[in-house]
Interface confidence: low
């Protein structure tokens, strides 16, 4: 004869475990139904009733079968630093995740707690790494004969034009500026354009500061941001 | 500044009764879970209790023939109201919100936020 | 009841010394586990949650790990601010709970 189906609650056999979607309750000592995602246990089994289910309130989920008291609140609306990629329903909590130009500085279980704006190298300074959605960008000092006029999160430093006569010479932060109509090389997107001939390898001075090229400091609540890294600006 | 303040606390007879007050400021009681704790002199920390977001209460076994949880919204203030108080009950009493309210209703992400706690003597 | 028994209850240390406080569950709570710290006359802080994660302005020398029913806290290199109590927490049962906090581990200077 094929074994009997026990019907929840029941009490499972000495060493036995209950089935799936079902839970132990201490105090009935029986196995119950655990309720389903979008739901949550608004009455506890007995020995003779089982769990009585009750769907989540507006705002509120459960994602897993569970015998919670109450559903999980769903995480505060998005900010506007956020992009809202999973909304909140039943079965779900909400998601935020950072918009473009940010990245997640706190993350949480799923999405991010705390956004932060991507450093931005300052002049004399290019992106060694860029950011991603859970790591700053990193700036490095450009290198003699390269150079970075820009205040940018994705720039990086480029090439000095070299010039037949040079009227100034290029440095960090700055491009070669040539004396006559056009330098030997096409420009690099983004530099100066100063009609002028071309000369020898400009001179280049480094910035002073030497700056971290480690990612910013963590962010930790309910602080803000700390201050950026030498080499960066905050916004 | 937010920041949860016990009150209430003081000497009482054995068999009396007492109401705890836990006043919140600068985030809505109501959209937290807040547990009561409390710890007697020289011993550990006790969970008597909590109450989640949507009101429900939480006790400990032993707490739940005595202790009654209840919240005040319009005050933003919590309540743990004590009957037949005996010498053991002598303790400091302590208030204690979930970091975030978003979660679970009881503590599962711990409690980041303290009062300064309240002392309450039973004695004769 | 469900039960959390810390050990060891008092521990005697050194400042540099890496320091091990294990949390022991009679049934399983997933990661629902915080841990604490107290001070003489303080309110307790708040360490770690869900298991591993670290509070908010918390030291990288604290950490956490474990799940189900064993629960570890380990300081790195212990500092002299971090003689202390230290206490567990359980957040995932409500039904039958005796105490939600563990006995306690006192952390003295050696």
């Known amino acids: 004869l094929p074994a009997q189906v026990a019907f929840t609650p029941y009490a499972p056999e000495p060493g036995s475990t209950c089935r799936l979607r079902e839970y132990y309750d201490q105090t009935a000592q029986m196995c119950c139904s655990k309720c389903s995602p979008g739901q949550h246990a608004k009455v506890f089994c007995t020995k003779t009733s089982d769990t009585v289910c009750d769907s989540c309130e507006d705002s509120t989920y459960t994602q897993l079968w569970n015998w919670v008291p109450e559903c999980l609140s769903c995480g505060s609306r998005c900010s506007s630093d956020q992009v809202e990629t999973q909304a909140c329903t039943r079965e779900q909590n909400r998601i935020c995740t950072c918009r473009p130009g940010w990245y997640c500085a706190l993350s949480k279980q799923e999405g991010c707690r705390l956004c932060a704006p991507l450093r931005k190298c300052r002049p004399g300074f290019g992106v060694a790494r860029p950011g991603t959605e859970t790591s700053d960008v990193v700036c490095k000092p450009c290198a003699p004969g390269t150079f970075s006029n820009t205040t940018s999160s994705t720039d990086i430093c480029r090439p000095h034009q070299i010039c037949n006569v040079v009227a100034i010479p290029g440095n960090a932060s700055m491009d070669a500026v040539c004396t006559s109509t056009s330098p030997t090389r096409s420009m690099a997107p983004g530099a100066v354009h100063l009609p002028q001939p071309v000369s020898t390898r400009s001179q280049h001075t480094q910035p002073t500061p030497e700056p971290s090229t480690a990612p910013s400091t963590s962010f930790l609540l309910p602080m803000g941001p700390s201050p950026p890294a030498e080499g960066s600006t905050g916004d | 500044e937010v920041q949860l303040v016990e009150s209430g606390g003081g000497l009482v007879q054995p068999g009396g009764s007492l109401r705890l007050s836990c006043a919140a400021s600068?985030?809505?009681?109501?959209?937290?879970?807040v547990s009561w704790v409390r710890q007697a002199p020289g011993k550990g920390l006790e969970w008597i209790g909590a109450?989640?977001?949507?009101?429900?209460?939480y006790y400990s076994n032993w707490a739940k023939s005595r202790f009654t949880i209840s919240r005040d919204n319009s005050k933003n203030t919590l309540y743990l109201q004590m009957n037949s108080l005996r010498a053991e009950d002598t303790a400091v009493y302590y208030c204690?919100?979930?970091?975030?309210?978003?979660?679970?209703?009881?503590?599962?992400?711990?409690?980041?936020?303290w009062g300064p706690g309240t002392l309450v003597t039973v004695s004769s | 009841d469900i039960q959390l028994t810390q050990s060891p209850s008092f521990l005697s240390a050194s400042v540099g010394d890496r320091v091990t406080i294990t949390c022991q569950v009679s049934?399983?709570?997933?990661?629902?586990l915080s841990w604490y710290q107290q001070k003489p006359g303080k309110a307790p802080k708040l360490l770690i949650y869900?298991?591993?994660t670290l509070a908010s302005g918390v030291p990288s020398r604290f950490s956490g790990s474990g799940s189900g029913t064993e629960f570890t806290l380990t300081i790195s290199s212990l500092q002299p601010e971090d003689f202390a109590t230290y206490y567990c927490?359980?957040?995932?049962?409500?039904?039958?709970?005796?105490?939600?906090f563990g006995g306690g581990t006192k952390v003295e200077i050696k």
């Open positions: 600068g985030f809505s009681l109501s959209s937290s879970a």
């Open positions: 049934q399983s709570i997933s990661s629902y």
């Open positions: 927490q359980q957040g995932y049962i409500t039904s039958n709970v005796g105490n939600a």
């Open positions: 204690a919100r979930d970091p975030n309210s978003s979660d679970y209703p009881y503590g599962a992400y711990g409690m980041g936020l």
């Open positions: 869900y298991a591993s």
């Open positions: 109450i989640g977001s949507g009101g429900t209460s």
